[in-house]
C-alpha cells in the first residue's frame, strides 16, 4: 500500500479468482484513543472499533472511503483505491490502446518544434468518475524539470455504439535548448482513477522523435504564362523553430485529382516553391517534415487548382 | 527516406554537400544495423544514449546559431572567440561561427572515425560475419574531414589484445551509430546555417 495523495491510498493486488488479497491496517488521524468506530462509504454499518482497523482487501467491494468517527463526529477519512496486477502486468482498463505507432500505445505525444513544448493525449470510453494527473521529467534517475498543465477533455467522438473521449495535456521542459542533442528521454507519467480503480501509464520519448510540424502556411498558386503549369509557393509555419536555415524543413508537394483513385503526382523539395501541372478539378497540397531528422510529416495544406 | 541530393554550385559553401552525404550514409548504416541485428537491443528505445565526444568537444555550443545565443538554456559552456581557419569558411566572414565550431566538428569526425575503424577490425574477426561498417560511410567521414582541412594530430587506431566480445561489440556499434546520426544531424544543420549566412 502507498499514498497517492493526502488520505488517498493505493492497494496493489495480485488479481486472480480466490486471491488472498492484502491485509491493510488503517489508523485514525486523531489524538483520541477511545470510542472510535469505523464505517465504509455511505453505509452506517460499523466495521470495527478502536484507533486502528485491520481489513483484508480482496475486491472492489473492500475499497472505498473508510471513515473513523467518535460520537457522531467524523475524525478522519482514508480512501482506498485498487491497482490490479494481472499475471505480472498492471491493468490497463481505463485507457484505450491506440495501437499507433505500435500495440500497447496508450499515450501519444507530439511537438510542433524543438522548444521543449509538447502535447500528449489519450482515449477512453469512460465518461464519469474519472480523474487524471500528469507528471513529466527529462530522465528518471536524476530527473530534470518538465511542467505539465491539467489534463482536459479535448474531443468527443462516436465510434460505433460507443462514445470515445480524448483527453490532452500540454507540457513544457523548464530549460530547453532547441539545438541540444537529447541523450535522456522525456518521461511522461499519467495517473488515472476511475471510481475505485487506480492505473498508471507511462511514455518515454525524445522530442526529436515526436516532432510533427504544423502545415506550411500561405499556400499560393501563380499560373505561368502560356502553360498548364503553376508555381506553388508557401512559407514555413509560424510555430516552427527558428532560425529556419538551421532548423530546415523539406516539403512534399502533391497534385491530387477529385477522385481518390486518380494517380497522385508528388514532388519533394527543400525550397518553399515548386512548379507543377495543375489539372482541372485537382487540388495541390503541401506538407512539411524536418529536413535532417525524419520524424512525422505535417498535415497537408491544400488549395484548389481552379 | 532518402534525403534529396543537392548538387552544390561551385561557389557554394563547400562542406554542405559533404555533410548531407554524411547524414545519408550514417542513416543508411543505422538502418542496416537495426535490420541485421534485429535480435540485439539496437533500437533507439533499447540502447543507452552515449556521446563519445562528451567533455572532449563542444559542437552544439560552439556552433550555436546567433539567434539562439539569447537562450540561456543553450549557453552552458560557450566559447566566445571567433573562428579564423578552416577552408569551409571559404573566405566568408561570419559572426555566427565561434572559435570551436568547425574544429569541433572536425574533432568529432576524427573521434568517430577512430572508433568505427577499431570496431570494424573487431567485426571482421567475428566468425558469424554478421555485420561490417559500410566503407562508403567511412569514406564520407574522410571526405568531410578533408574538406574541413584542419591540421590535427593523428589519433592512433586503438588496438586490443583481448579476445573481442562480439555481442558487446555489436551493441556498442548500435550505440555509436545512434549517437553519430544525432551528431550528423547537428553538423548538417550547422552547414545549412553557414551556407545561408
Amino acid at each position: 500500500i502507498w499514498e497517492l495523495k493526502k488520505d488517498v491510498y493505493v492497494v496493489e493486488l495480485d488479481w486472480y479468482p480466490d486471491a488472498p488479497g492484502e491485509m491493510v491496517v488503517l489508523t485514525c488521524d486523531t489524538p483520541e484513543e477511545d470510542g472510535i468506530t469505523w464505517t465504509l462509504d455511505q453505509s452506517s454499518e460499523v466495521l470495527g472499533s478502536g484507533k486502528t482497523l485491520t481489513i483484508q482487501v480482496k475486491e472492489f467491494g473492500d475499497a472505498g472511503q473508510y471513515t473513523c468517527h467518535k460520537g457522531g463526529e467524523v475524525l478522519s477519512h482514508s480512501l482506498l483505491l485498487l491497482h490490479k496486477k494481472e499475471d505480472g502486468i498492471w491493468s490497463t482498463d481505463i485507457l484505450k490502446d491506440q495501437k499507433e505507432p505500435k500495440n500497447k500505445t496508450f499515450l501519444r505525444c507530439e511537438a510542433k518544434n524543438y522548444s521543449g513544448r509538447f502535447t500528449c493525449w489519450w482515449l477512453t470510453t469512460i465518461s464519469t468518475d474519472l480523474t487524471f494527473s500528469v507528471k513529466s521529467s527529462r530522465g528518471s534517475s536524476d530527473p530534470q524539470g518538465v511542467t505539465c498543465g491539467a489534463a482536459t477533455l479535448s474531443a468527443e467522438r462516436v465510434r460505433g455504439d460507443n462514445k470515445e473521449y480524448e483527453y490532452s495535456v500540454e507540457c513544457q521542459e523548464d530549460s530547453a535548448c532547441p539545438a541540444a542533442e537529447e541523450s535522456l528521454p522525456i518521461e511522461v507519467m499519467v495517473d488515472a482513477v476511475h471510481k475505485l480503480k487506480y492505473e498508471n501509464y507511462t511514455s518515454s520519448f525524445f522530442i526529436r522523435d515526436i516532432i510533427k510540424p504544423d502545415p506550411p502556411k500561405n499556400l499560393q498558386l501563380k499560373p505561368l504564362k502560356n502553360s498548364r503549369q503553376v508555381e506553388v509557393s508557401w512559407e514555413y509555419p509560424d510555430t516552427w523553430s527558428t532560425p529556419h536555415s538551421y532548423f530546415s524543413l523539406t516539403f512534399c508537394v502533391q497534385v491530387q485529382g477529385k477522385s481518390k483513385r486518380e494517380k497522385k503526382d508528388r514532388v519533394f523539395t527543400d525550397k518553399t516553391s515548386a512548379t507543377v501541372i495543375c489539372r482541372k478539378n485537382a487540388s495541390i497540397s503541401v506538407r512539411a517534415q524536418d529536413r535532417y531528422y525524419s520524424s512525422s510529416w505535417s498535415e497537408w495544406a491544400s488549395v484548389p487548382c481552379s | 527516406r532518402n534525403l534529396p541530393v543537392a548538387t552544390p554550385d561551385p561557389g557554394m559553401f563547400p562542406c554542405l554537400h559533404h555533410s548531407q552525404n554524411l547524414l545519408r550514409a550514417v542513416s543508411n548504416m543505422l538502418q542496416k544495423a537495426r535490420q541485421t541485428l534485429e535480435f540485439y537491443p539496437c533500437t533507439s528505445e533499447e540502447i543507452d544514449h552515449e556521446d563519445i565526444t562528451k567533455d572532449k568537444t563542444s559542437t552544439v555550443e560552439a556552433c550555436l546559431p546567433l539567434e539562439l545565443t539569447k537562450n540561456e538554456s543553450c549557453l552552458n559552456s560557450r566559447e566566445t572567440s571567433f573562428i579564423t581557419n578552416g577552408s569551409c569558411l571559404a573566405s566568408r566572414k561570419t559572426s555566427f561561427m565561434m572559435a570551436l565550431c568547425l574544429s569541433s566538428i572536425y574533432e568529432d569526425l576524427k573521434m568517430y572515425q577512430v572508433e568505427f575503424k577499431t570496431m570494424n577490425a573487431k567485426l571482421l574477426m567475428d566468425p558469424k560475419r554478421q555485420i561490417f561498417l559500410d566503407q562508403n560511410m567511412l569514406a564520407v567521414i574522410d571526405e568531410l574531414m578533408q574538406a574541413l582541412n584542419f591540421n590535427s594530430e593523428t589519433v592512433p587506431q586503438k588496438s586490443s589484445l583481448e579476445e573481442p566480445d562480439f555481442y558487446k561489440t555489436k551493441i556498442k556499434l548500435c550505440i555509436l551509430l545512434h549517437a553519430f546520426r544525432i551528431r550528423a544531424v547537428t553538423i548538417d544543420r550547422v552547414m545549412s546555417y553557414l551556407n545561408a549566412s
Partner: antibody, heavy 115, light 112 residues
Framework: QVQLVESGGGVVQPGRSLRLSCAAS????????MHWVRQAPGKGLEWVAF????????YYADSVKGRFTISRDNSKNTLYLQMNSLRAEDTAVYYC????????WGQGTMVTVSS | QSVLTQPPSVSGAPGQRVTISCSGS????????VKWYQQLPGTAPKLLIY???QRPSGVPDRFSGSKSGTSASLAITGLQAEDEADYYC????????????FGTGTKVTVLA
C-alpha cells in the same frame, strides 16, 4: 472453490458452426478476464482468444480471427466461444481458463471437425 | 508455430535432476514473467510455477523455476515416476499481450 465447466463440443462438418460454453462458479466471474485455449490431438497448447472482465476488449489468435467470436454473459457467469466456418485443423480439446498469476482451467470439451 | 522453444523430450532415472529450457526473445520472456504447467495424459494443464520462480501452494518443492534474460528453465530434482508428463512454459509478448504464448512442450520420461 473456483470451478469451470466447458460444454458444447461434438462432431461437426467442415464449414459448419458450433458454440462452446464455459460455466463459472465459486468466484466473482464479472471481475476477471477469461481465455480459451485449445490442444489438437497429440499436439501442444495453443491460445485461441481472450475477453476482458467487462467484455470491452476481445483478442484473437490469427488462426481463428474472423471465424471465432468470444463473448460473455456476466449475469449468467458464462463464457462463450462461437466457432464459424470450422476447419479440420480446428479439431482439438477446448479449455476455458481464468486470467491471472494463479489460473484455473476447465476439464475441456472435444471438438472434432470431420466430413 | 510457437515462439517459445523447448526441447521435445528429456529423461532421467528416479531421484535424478532434470531441467527443461524455454527460449524466447526480448519482447516476450525478456519483458514478461514466465509460468510452467504440467499436463498429465487426458487432463487439463496444472500450474507448477508462476512469476518465473514462485510455486503455488500444493506444488512440491522438487519443482523450481528460474529466468535469465530471454530464457527460462524448470528444474525437477529427485525425479519421481508421477512426474512423467508433458511440461509447457508460458509467457506474453509485450506487443500482443494478453495473448498467451506457450512453449512447444517437453515430454519428461522417467526411466525404469
Amino acid at each position: 472453490q473456483v470451478q469451470l465447466v466447458e460444454s458444447g463440443g461434438g462432431v461437426v462438418q467442415p464449414g459448419r458452426s458450433l458454440r462452446l460454453s464455459c460455466a463459472a462458479s465459486g468466484f466473482t466471474f464479472s471481475s476477471y478476464g477469461m481465455h480459451w485455449v485449445r490442444q489438437a490431438p497429440g499436439k501442444g497448447l495453443e491460445w485461441v482468444a481472450f475477453i476482458e472482465y467487462d467484455g470491452s476488449n476481445k483478442y484473437y489468435a490469427d488462426s481463428v480471427k474472423g471465424r471465432f467470436t468470444i463473448s460473455r454473459d456476466n449475469s449468467k457467469n458464462t463464457l462463450y466461444l462461437q466457432m464459424n466456418s470450422l476447419r479440420a485443423e480446428d479439431t482439438a480439446v477446448y479449455y476455458c481458463k481464468t486470467h491471472g498469476s494463479h489460473d484455473n482451467w476447465g476439464q475441456g470439451t472435444m471438438v472434432t471437425v470431420s466430413s | 508455430q510457437s515462439v517459445l522453444t523447448q526441447p521435445p523430450s528429456v529423461s532421467g532415472a528416479p531421484g535424478q535432476r532434470v531441467t527443461i529450457s524455454c527460449s524466447g526473445s526480448r519482447s516476450n520472456i525478456g519483458s514478461n514473467t514466465v509460468k510452467w504447467y504440467q499436463q498429465l495424459p487426458g487432463t487439463a494443464p496444472k500450474l507448477l510455477i508462476y512469476y518465473n520462480d514462485q510455486r503455488p501452494s500444493g506444488v512440491p518443492d522438487r519443482f523450481s523455476g528460474s529466468k535469465s534474460g530471454t530464457s527460462a528453465s524448470l528444474a525437477i530434482t529427485g525425479l519421481q515416476a508421477e512426474d512423467e508428463a508433458d511440461y509447457y512454459c508460458q509467457s506474453y509478448d509485450r506487443y500482443t499481450h494478453p495473448a498467451l504464448l506457450f512453449g512447444t512442450g517437453t515430454k519428461v520420461t522417467v526411466l525404469a
